[in-house]
Interface confidence: medium
Amino acid sequence: ESGYAQNGDLEDAELDDYSFSCYSQLEVNGSQHSLTCAFEDPDVNTTNLEFEICGALVEVKCLNFRKLQEIYFIETKKFLLIGKSNICVKVGEKSLTCKKIDLTTIVKPEAPFDLSVIYREGANDFVVTFNTSHLQKKYVKVLMHDVAYRQEKDENKWTHVNLSSTKLTLLQRKLQPAAMYEIKVRSIPDHYFKGFWSEWSPSYYFRTPEINNSSGEMD
């Protein structure tokens, strides 16, 4: 009757852990927003499982997600962005688990890009700059950035600097001379929107000058 018997009874399915997490990305493709959800247990059998979002939508009551391998995804202009939406995991018409979520509190920004480091010899410092697509956005404009850098040989010894601008100055005397450094940056919503860290930008690698023995400064 249900049409799902060949894949196990619904009663069996209810024993599984269908907990999931989601993140939203606003104006990720022009004026389109996206919402991505995935099960927290990677071993969940997702056959016949669907995700649906209802409420806090413009023009429609509910929207169905598309499935892309193990993630579920919506791209739409129809998020109201005020009020909570109900996101449910469904088998047919039966909801297995639901969460009420305000999409403005689960925003994951796009990763920063164009990270670069320029050494200023006269100032004895390094100017770190990067770009973010959010400067041009209508909604998620205000971000906090996390710049992380390490000496390449120090696998897990990252130094983090939080900033709201897209430019940072690193003093030469704070870095080891004649060393290769890796630097990367990520962003998180600040101000009205809340959410998660973006993916890291691609890493940028730079070398510090050697110490000039006569002056005690780096070359």
């Epitope: 413009v58 023009e59 009551k61 305000d102």
Partner: antibody
Framework: EVQLVESGGGLVQPGRSLRLSCAAS????????MHWVRQAPGKGLEWVSG????????GYADSVKGRFTIFRDNAKNSLYLQMNSLRAEDTALYYC??????????????WGQGTTVTVSS | AIQLTQSPSSLSASVGDRVTITCRAS??????AAWYQQKPGKAPKLLIY???SLESGVPSRFSGSGSGTDFTLTISSLQPEDFATYYC???????????FGQGTRLEIK
């Protein structure tokens, strides 16, 4: 039963302040945006202000911006409107209204009976 | 802010008549329109949302249509309890604000 009860209205002199309250019951208050709408005697409806469920989304009509402040206390299921620098043109019946976002967007599906504010010297 | 203009501002009709009220937005608002009914001394009551969806408990003689800039409320056969003032409404989500039309007063002829 879903219910909204406004209070705090009264007669006040121009330039003075007044705080309106709205007590909500019968629904999960912190799931919903809330609004204040007013109606001057013999006139139409005018939206005054709205606030999202978590107080992070707030809006005001141009006519009250900088003078009125909307806020809410989800623990007390209450909505408030702090009205400062009142003017004669603020005289109206003030309604509290619940926003039913599951209808698709800002839809005011439950209204209180209103509280009257009269600004006069 | 978007302006909403209702027409007519008032109209007289008889029981059993078919009545149409229009609401024009100064710019396109998709299908984001709602209609309310208000009787003297009472709070407004939601009739139609999403331009054409009927609120539960509202008689089926009420219907809504339209999109973009032009929206219509139709009462197919007027009943005595329908004589009231009707308002259209629209919204903007960011920044948050709501706009009402100026109202249409429906009177008994």
């Amino acid at each position: 039963e879903v219910q909204l009860v406004e209070s705090g209205g009264g007669l006040v002199q121009p330039g003075r302040s007044l705080r309106l309250s709205c007590a909500a019951s019968g629904f999960t208050f912190d799931d919903h945006a809330m609004h204040w709408v007013r109606q001057a005697p013999g006139k139409g409806l005018e939206w005054v202000s709205g606030i999202s469920w978590n107080s992070r989304g707030i809006g005001y009509a141009d006519s009250v911006k900088g003078r009125f402040t909307i806020f809410r206390d989800n623990a007390k299921n209450s909505l408030y409107l702090q009205m400062n620098s009142l003017r004669a043109e603020d005289t109206a019946l003030y309604y509290c209204a619940k926003d039913e976002y599951s209808r698709g967007y800002y839809v005011l599906d439950v209204w209180g009976q209103g509280t009257t504010v009269t600004v006069s010297s | 802010a978007i302006q909403l203009t209702q027409s007519p501002s008032s109209l007289s009709a008889s029981v059993g008549d078919r009545v149409t009220i229009t609401c024009r937005a100064s710019q396109g608002i998709s299908s984001a329109a709602a209609w309310y009914q208000q009787k003297p001394g009472k709070a407004p009551k939601l009739l139609i949302y999403d331009a054409s969806s009927l609120e539960s408990g509202v008689p089926s003689r009420f219907s809504g249509s339209g999109s973009g800039t032009d929206f219509t409320l139709t009462i197919s056969s007027l009943q005595p309890e329908d004589f009231a003032t009707y308002y259209c409404q629209q919204f903007n989500s960011y920044p948050l604000w709501i706009t009402f039309g100026q109202g249409t007063r429906l009177e008994i002829k």
